[in-house]
Interface confidence: low
């Protein structure tokens, strides 16, 4: 974008401030909260989006059983520390010096501790299971149509490579989308499954992160697919470390 163009906005992230102050007068966008420059040609990392959100004014066709090591984000929102590339720092702490370790999608994977807690590495979430329940419809959706539509959505809206959508399961009214992406599979420029899942989650909640696009209008063969509940399970390359008292 050049300085002469009025349309200096970030198509993939509305939680940005953009101005034509980049090299050669090009449009440059910075994430709210962190002030970090973002690449508007792709999804912004979940860490920078959470940080921006915290700074914004408050307003076989069997279903997969998540493994015992699957994490659910029960802690909700927090103001995360992001590294210079916009990824979550392995250790997160709050204002009261309570610290914990997170995975690559920012979900807590250890018990909470104090400032002495060590998190040696950022553990990658390599498998995400998105569990949806749709509102009642006249009949069940055709599984292959549903599969194709959800794959198209992840490919076109979130620019996630099709090879990372491992499976779409359906047993009315439950839909499960499996995303898989090992460290070795992720090439430069590939959208991260954690970021795609976060954009999808926000879309489903009617809180689209895209600039100026309408909300998500999901249809299967013209029939609206309306989601009434979403649960997301995260599986890490290394199992989480919680004490037994949390598990009972």
């Amino acid at each position: 974008h050049t300085a002469a163009q009025d349309n200096c906005t970030c198509p993939t992230n509305k939680m940005t401030v953009c101005s034509p102050d980049g090299p050669g007068g090009r449009c440059q966008c910075r994430a709210l909260g962190s002030g970090m420059a973002v690449d508007c040609s792709t999804l912004t990392s979940k860490c920078l989006l959470l940080k921006a959100r915290m700074s914004a004014p408050k307003n076989a066709r069997t279903l997969v059983r998540p493994s015992e090591h699957a994490l659910v984000d029960n802690d909700g929102l927090y103001d995360p520390d992001c590294d210079p590339e916009g990824r979550f720092k392995a250790r997160q702490c709050n204002q009261t010096s309570v610290c914990w370790c997170v995975n690559s999608v920012g979900v807590r994977r250890t018990d909470k501790g104090d400032l002495s807690l060590r998190c040696d590495e950022l553990v990658r979430t390599h498998h995400i299971l998105i569990d949806l329940r749709h509102r009642p419809t006249a009949g069940a959706f055709n599984h292959s149509d549903l599969d194709a539509e959800l794959r198209r959505l992840f490919r076109e809206r979130y620019r996630l490579h099709p090879k990372f959508v491992a499976a779409v399961h359906y047993e009315q009214p439950t839909i499960q989308i499996e995303l898989r992406q090992n460290t070795s599979q992720k090439a430069a420029g590939d959208v991260d499954i954690g970021d795609a899942a976060y954009y999808f989650e926000r879309d489903i909640k009617g809180e689209s992160l895209f600039q100026g696009r309408g909300g998500l209008d999901l249809r299967v063969r013209g029939e609206p697919l309306q989601v009434e509940r979403t649960l997301i399970y995260y599986l890490d390359e290394i199992p989480p470390k919680f004490s037994m008292k949390r598990l009972t």
């Epitope: 050669g24 090009r26 690449d39 508007c40 040609s41 792709t42 090879k163 420029g189 590939d190 959208v191």
Partner: antibody
Framework: QVQLVQSGAEVKKPGASVKVSCKAS????????MQWVRQAPGQGLEWMGW????????KYAEDFKGRVTISADTSTSTAYLQLSSLKSEDTAVYYC??????????????WGQGTLVTVSS | DIQMTQSPSSLSASVGDRVTITCKAS??????VAWYQQKPGKAPKLLIY???YRYTGVPSRFSGSGSGTDFTLTISSLQPEDFAVYYC?????????FGQGTKLEIK
């Protein structure tokens, strides 16, 4: 539907410059990259470079650096290829083609119809 | 630069035949290979991307396979409209490079 429409054929003298345009329609221009490929008569395909339409940043093949400029006007959804210091060997059909932004997406799913540039004294 | 070497450079076959075109990369390109079909006077058309993903609207008789350095485009049963030139392309790293092309002719 998604379409890339290129400007018409050009005849140029050696040493001159040519600017080829490629107007995109049917999709949001800034959500895809624009690549440029040329094909000399009876020859194969040769990649010249591409532009990230969201950031405006171009990247060129080494063989064309210094002679080629790729740009984009997001207000008109148009990409441009300018080639200077033309030689007879630059006689070719020049294609624009849509791609994604990252390396996993640098394949070309939609192509323009091509622009024949003839360099002759 | 990564060289993409296609073989054969030309091929004669009949309608109904099964045809295989191979492409060898000079270094590992993972699965980042695309295949295109080009007819005289026309722009190329995308058939396969990421080695094995058939592009929207491409008939199922076209399939792609391979990873690393060796890739294959297979047409399971040739149709009259399939006679054309086929190109492979690596989309792993810039500069993006193409094979020299395989001309598929009617026997």
């Amino acid at each position: 539907q998604v379409q890339l429409v290129q400007s018409g054929a050009e005849v140029k003298k050696p040493g001159a410059s040519v600017k080829v345009s490629c107007k995109a329609s049917g999709y949001t221009f800034t959500t895809a990259g624009m690549q440029w490929v040329r094909q000399a008569p009876g020859q194969g395909l040769e990649w010249m470079g591409w532009i990230n339409t969201a950031s405006g940043v171009p990247k060129y093949a080494e063989d064309f650096k210094g002679r080629v400029t790729i740009s984009a006007d997001t207000s008109t959804s148009t990409a441009y290829l300018q080639l200077s210091s033309l030689k007879s060997e630059d006689t070719a059909v020049y294609y624009c083609a849509r791609s994604g932004f990252g390396s996993s997406y640098w394949y070309f799913d939609v192509w323009g119809q091509g622009t024949l540039v003839t360099v002759s004294s | 630069d990564i060289q993409m070497t296609q073989s054969p450079s030309s091929l004669s076959a009949s309608v109904g035949d099964r045809v295989t075109i191979t492409c060898k990369a000079s270094q590992d390109v993972s699965t980042a290979v695309a295949w295109y079909q080009q007819k005289p006077g026309k722009a190329p058309k995308l058939l396969i991307y990421s080695a094995s993903y058939r592009y929207t609207g491409v008939p199922s008789r076209f399939s792609g396979s391979g990873s690393g350095t060796d890739f294959t485009l297979t047409i399971s049963s040739l149709q009259p409209e399939d006679f054309a030139v086929y190109y492979c392309q690596q989309h792993y790293i810039t500069p993006l490079t193409f094979g020299q092309g395989t001309k598929l002719e009617i026997k």
